[in-house]
C-alpha cells in the first residue's frame, strides 16, 4: 500500500507512517515503528504538557516568584501550568501575570475612567473620537483635541486616539 501523506487527528507522520501522539501530561520517548506503538512517559514533578504532542521534553511549571509579589493561584498538574497571581493589594501587569504593580496604567489611546482604590485596580477606557491620550498613565483621563477654530486656525493634521490635532494658519486667498 501507498505510504500515507496525512494522518488522523492525534497522530503524526514520521518515516512514512502514522504514529500516535502522546497524550497531555506525557512526553515522547520513541516514535512508533512498523511493529511497536509510540512510547510515551509521564512528565516529572513540576513539569507539564498541555496538548497531544510529540515533545521529547516537558515544560517546567511557571515559578511564582515571591520577590516579584507573586503567589500560586492554582498549582500546576502534569497537564496544566501553574497559574500565578499577585499578593493582596497588588495587580498583575499582564494576562500572564509575570510581575506585580500597585495599580495598572492605561496605555496610550486609553484614559483613566476610575483611579485605583485599595480594593480595585485602575479602570481604563478607550479615548472616544475627539479625545486622545499620548501617555501611559494610572491617573490621566483622555484629553479633548485642541479646537483649532477657537484659535482662528485650521486643522492641518487630524487627531487620533493617541495624538492631538495639529493646527496651522488659514490660507489667505488674495482677490
Amino acid at each position: 500500500p501507498e505510504p500515507p501523506t496525512a494522518c488522523r487527528e492525534k497522530q503524526y507522520l514520521i518515516n512514512s507512517q502514522c504514529c500516535s501522539l502522546c497524550q497531555p501530561g506525557q512526553k515522547l520517548v520513541s516514535d512508533c515503528t512498523e511493529f511497536t506503538e509510540t512510547e510515551c512517559l509521564p512528565c516529572g514533578e513540576s513539569e507539564f504538557l498541555d496538548t497531544w504532542n510529540r515533545e521529547t521534553h516537558c515544560h517546567q511549571h511557571k515559578y511564582c516568584d515571591p520577590n516579584l509579589g507573586l503567589r500560586v493561584q492554582q498549582k500546576g498538574t502534569s497537564e496544566t501550568d501553574t497559574i500565578c497571581t499577585c499578593e493582596e493589594g497588588w495587580h498583575c501587569t499582564s494576562e500572564a501575570c509575570e510581575s506585580c504593580v500597585l495599580h495598572r496604567s492605561c496605555s496610550p489611546g486609553f484614559g483613566v475612567k476610575q483611579i485605583a482604590t485599595g480594593v480595585s485596580d485602575t479602570i481604563c477606557e478607550p479615548c472616544p473620537v475627539g479625545f486622545f491620550s499620548n501617555v501611559s498613565s494610572a491617573f490621566e483621563k483622555c484629553h479633548p483635541w485642541t479646537s483649532c477654530e477657537t484659535k482662528d486656525l485650521v486643522v492641518q493634521q487630524a487627531g487620533t486616539n493617541k495624538t492631538d490635532v495639529v493646527c496651522g494658519p488659514q490660507d489667505r486667498l488674495r482677490a
Epitope: C100, V101, A138, F139, E140
Partner: nanobody, 116 residues
C-alpha cells in the same frame, strides 16, 4: 539603575507640617509619572499622591486631599510632598516611586511619625 531616595521624615505634632523630598536617578525623570505611597505600621501599601511628567496633572487620595501638595522640579530630578495639618493616621513610612509602582522596587522610604 533606577534609584529613588525619600527623605524629610521625622516626628511632628498633630496639626504640624513636613516636606518630603525624593531624589531620583537612573531614568529620564521628566518623562515619568511619579507617585508617593505610604505604609502604616501593620498595614498594606496605600497610594497618597501622584503627578504627571510635566507637573501639570496632580492627583490625591481622598484621605489627604486639601492637606497634602505634590510637586516636582525636573531640573533637579526631585519630587516633593508638602504635608500640612498632619494627623496621627498619617503616621507611616513614605516611599516615592515611578508609575507603574512595582512590587520588586520600592526604593528607600522615610518615616513620618505624628504624635503629641
Amino acid at each position: 539603575e533606577v534609584q529613588l531616595l525619600a527623605s524629610g521624615g521625622g516626628l511632628v505634632q498633630p496639626g504640624g507640617s513636613l516636606r518630603l523630598s525624593c531624589a531620583a536617578s537612573g531614568f529620564t525623570f521628566e518623562e515619568e509619572e511619579m507617585i508617593w505611597v505610604r505604609q502604616a505600621p501593620g498595614k498594606g501599601l496605600e497610594w497618597v499622591s501622584a503627578i504627571s511628567g510635566s507637573g501639570g496633572g496632580t492627583y490625591y487620595a481622598d484621605s489627604v486631599k486639601g492637606r497634602f501638595t505634590i510637586s516636582r522640579d525636573n531640573s533637579k530630578n526631585t519630587l516633593y510632598l508638602q504635608m500640612n495639618s498632619l494627623r496621627a493616621e498619617d503616621t507611616a513610612v513614605y516611599y516615592c516611586g515611578k508609575e507603574p509602582f512595582r512590587y520588586d522596587y520600592w526604593g528607600q522610604g522615610t518615616l513620618v511619625t505624628v504624635s503629641s
